[in-house]
Interface confidence: low
């Protein structure tokens, strides 16, 4: 997704925001969390 | 290292009120979801509620919603659980723990005890 | 809710054995990114519960290469491949897929 619908996604999930760091490991992709966002965005 | 100590716990009676504090150390607080999770004595574990890095976000358990409100200061790393009209089976060690992606319950802390007695 | 349940609800195993666990949901834990969020926990007796498997099968970091997990769907598995000591406890899967999250109800190993 392009900035603009990423940063909404973000500002509406639940759960972490983009500046998650990593804490021993990671636990999922960048990826993921871009797929995570948009799964609450479309589940509200 | 990464940290979470609950605080606040105690006895109450029925009806009335009791605020938990959980305070962070360790990682970027303002970057994570925040869950508490209960367990009754010599029971299972319910989750309760989640709150998002940012606040603006929350969900709740059937069981405690409109009587608990969870609440978070990015400020002094501090997430809180507002318990009202607290109930005989809301009795058990309240836990705070950070949310990964996924919610992931990654960092657990090591639990206050909530007593409702009469 | 998606009800989580555990087989056995308790296991002694003997020292240096293997140990499974498994745990069923009612519906399938597959989300609509694919993932599939159903996480083990580990309680020692005194302790807060501990991040052992996340996502089915992945450690989190600083657990031991023993404990794995696997499965799909609605039926999952956690396995000890040589049980130890500090292994005895209480151990949890949880479902973090749809609200409200749900845990099973727990599975106590303990040594025979």
């Known amino acids: 997704g392009g900035g603009g619908s990423k940063h909404k996604c973000v500002q509406n999930s639940l759960v972490n925001n983009e500046t998650l760091e990593s804490i021993m490991n990671t636990l999922e992709s960048e990826e993921d969390f871009r797929k995570y966002f948009y799964y609450l965005e479309g589940s509200k | 290292q990464v940290q979470l100590v609950e605080s606040g716990g105690g006895v109450v009676q029925p009806g009335r009120s009791l605020r938990l504090s959980c305070a962070a150390s360790g990682f970027t607080f303002s970057s994570y979801g925040m869950h508490w999770v209960r367990q009754a004595p010599g029971k299972g574990l319910e989750w309760v509620a989640v709150i998002s890095y940012d606040g603006n976000n929350k969900h709740f358990a059937d069981s405690v919603k409109g009587r608990f409100t969870i609440s978070r200061d990015n400020s002094k790393n501090t997430l809180n659980l507002q318990m009202n009209s607290l109930r005989a089976e809301d009795r058990a060690v309240y836990y705070c723990?950070?949310?990964?992606?996924?919610?992931?319950?990654?960092?657990w802390g090591q639990g206050t005890m909530v007593t409702v007695s009469s | 809710d998606i009800v989580m349940t555990q087989t056995p609800l308790s296991s002694p195993v003997t020292l240096g054995q293997p140990a499974s666990i498994s745990c069923r949901s009612s519906q399938s834990l597959v989300r609509s990114d694919g993932n599939t969020y159903l996480s083990w926990l580990q309680q020692r007796p005194g302790q807060p519960p501990r991040l052992l498997i996340y996502?089915?099968?992945n450690r989190f970091s600083g657990v031991p290469d023993r404990f794995s997990g696997s499965g799909a769907g609605t039926d999952f598995t956690l396995k000890i491949s040589r049980v130890e000591a500090e292994d005895v406890g209480i151990y949890f899967c949880?479902?973090?897929?749809?609200?409200?999250?749900?845990f099973g109800p727990g599975t106590k190993v303990d040594i025979k």
């Open positions: 996502k089915i099968s």
């Open positions: 723990a950070r949310g990964a992606s996924g919610f992931v319950l990654d960092i």
């Open positions: 949880m479902q973090t897929t749809q609200f409200p999250f749900t």
